[in-house]
Interface confidence: low
Amino acid sequence: FVRTKIDTTENLLNTEVHSSPAQRWSMQVPAEVSAAAGDAAVLPCTFTHPHRHYDGPLTAIWRAGEPYAGPQVFRCAAARGSELCQTALSLHGRFRLLGNPRRNDLSLRVERLALADDRRYFCRVEFAGDVHDRYESRHGVRLHVTAAPRIINISVLPGPAHAFRALCTAEGEPPPALAWSGPALGNGSAAVPSSGQGHGHLVTAELPALNHDGRYTCTAANSLGRSEASVYLFRFHGASGASTHHHHHHHH
């Protein structure tokens, strides 16, 4: 099977004279890997290359965000003939090589996942020495991090005409649905996505008018769990006070 489109950007200086005609540069990665926040994830990446029996120096690299230009999160180097790829970079110490680059395997393990890790990752291998060649996954593997809801902020703020309003911001993946409950509340709550923060995992709900003193509770829920936080409103002489109270419920 041969494609009609030729891409020279991913197959540079492919000069090994003993290359096998049956092999070419290619990388195999899943388009997506899913894992829960706090857990570990494996990003598989295997490759083929035309340089038969290559045992010269090599470097394995993983970068995040975009191919070729994204920031590196992991890098290791193996000396000529060595099966050991010495780690030179592991961002926050959470990335480690599972595969053996000498065996065409660059699979990576990411520890202690956070929602901020939800992005695309790209593996790359570089040969040096007698052969100078390199290849990088162009599409990469998307790491999808799931998380039960967590309310990260709940507050009461001054509103128009000496009234008060409440804001509740939660994070989670899938993005949680937010609901307010409180004294004499009708359909006053409104959940709106936040302005692009946190890779879209943040959701904010505003309660535009707090007309009664008492406890107002924000509930965030998704398929993985539920979280609640409350704010107490009490008014005297035009001032307000508030205290907060949190509950988390995880579905197992």
């Epitope: 489109k5 388009a31 598989p44 996954s137 162009r138 998307r142």
Partner: antibody
Framework: QVQLKQSGAELVRPGTSVQMSCKAV????????IGWVKQRPGHGLEWVGD????????NNNEKFRGKATLTADTSSSTAYMQLRGLTSDDSAIYYC???????????????WGQGTSVTVSS | QIVLSQSPALLSASPGEKVTMTCRAS?????MYWYQQKPGSSPKPWIY???NLTSGVPARFSGSGSGTSYSLTISRVEAEDAATYFC?????????FGGGSKLEIR
């Protein structure tokens, strides 16, 4: 040349299980993913899941979780799919296909088996 | 999941005519892929990454589109083009296919 040879047609009873095979020849089995696709008349094509024999890693369509189990035997370059708890909805042709995930900037199922027909009937 | 809707489901054309079939995605995808299937045969990869023809596909075929709308066009239909064409996305799991557009030659 590259070929994927699938096992023959199956006629099975409701509630039972069936295992079909997909033997790969003409390429390095551990370097590529093998995907499985279901085709029912009037229902188009449906991705069931795929497996990378080299790292024993699987992707699954949640719809088929508990229904389909994918395995691979690298010694015989053969991929397997087992379907259990069979009902009439499982009657279909099941294809295996080699998945070229990242070469030349694209993904594609580049070689397909001839299909295994499964008929569930009492 | 991303739902791919193909139209028309059935189209009939005479040799030499130009035909276009479309594939609409329920949410934006980066690329679209097309497969050709003839009765009694397995699907064959036909167009990859929206507009690139696989080896052996005649130049009268072309693919285009972006976002949620993609199309496959045959500039001058020939009898051998009679088949069902499926679109497919690799953007997010589960990978999904369209319901197919069946091309008949009059």
């Amino acid at each position: 040349q590259v070929q994927l040879k699938q096992s023959g047609a199956e006629l099975v009873r409701p509630g039972t299980s069936v295992q079909m095979s997909c033997k790969a020849v003409g390429y390095t089995f551990t370097n590529y993913w093998i995907g499985w696709v279901k085709q029912r008349p009037g229902h188009g094509l449906e991705w069931v899941g795929d497996i990378h024999p080299g790292i024993n890693y699987t992707n699954n369509n949640e719809k088929f979780r508990g229904k389909a189990t994918l395995t691979a035997d690298t010694s015989s370059s053969t991929a397997y799919m087992q379907l259990r708890g069979l009902t009439s909805d499982d009657s279909a042709i099941y294809y295996c296909a080699r998945v070229d995930y990242d070469y030349d900037g694209s993904y594609i199922m580049d070689y397909w088996g001839q299909g295994t027909s499964v008929t569930v009937s009492s | 999941q991303i739902v791919l809707s193909q139209s028309p489901a059935l189209l009939s054309a005479s040799p030499g005519e130009k035909v276009t079939m479309t594939c609409r995605a329920s949410s934006s995808v980066s690329y679209m892929y097309w497969y050709q299937q003839k009765p009694g045969s397995s699907p064959k990869p036909w167009i990859y990454a929206t507009s690139n023809l696989t080896s052996g596909v005649p130049a009268r075929f072309s693919g285009s589109g972006s976002g949620t709308s993609y199309s496959l066009t045959i500039s001058r239909v020939e009898a051998e083009d009679a088949a069902t064409y499926f679109c497919q996305q690799w953007n997010s799991k589960p990978w999904t296919f369209g319901g197919g557009s069946k091309l008949e030659i009059r």
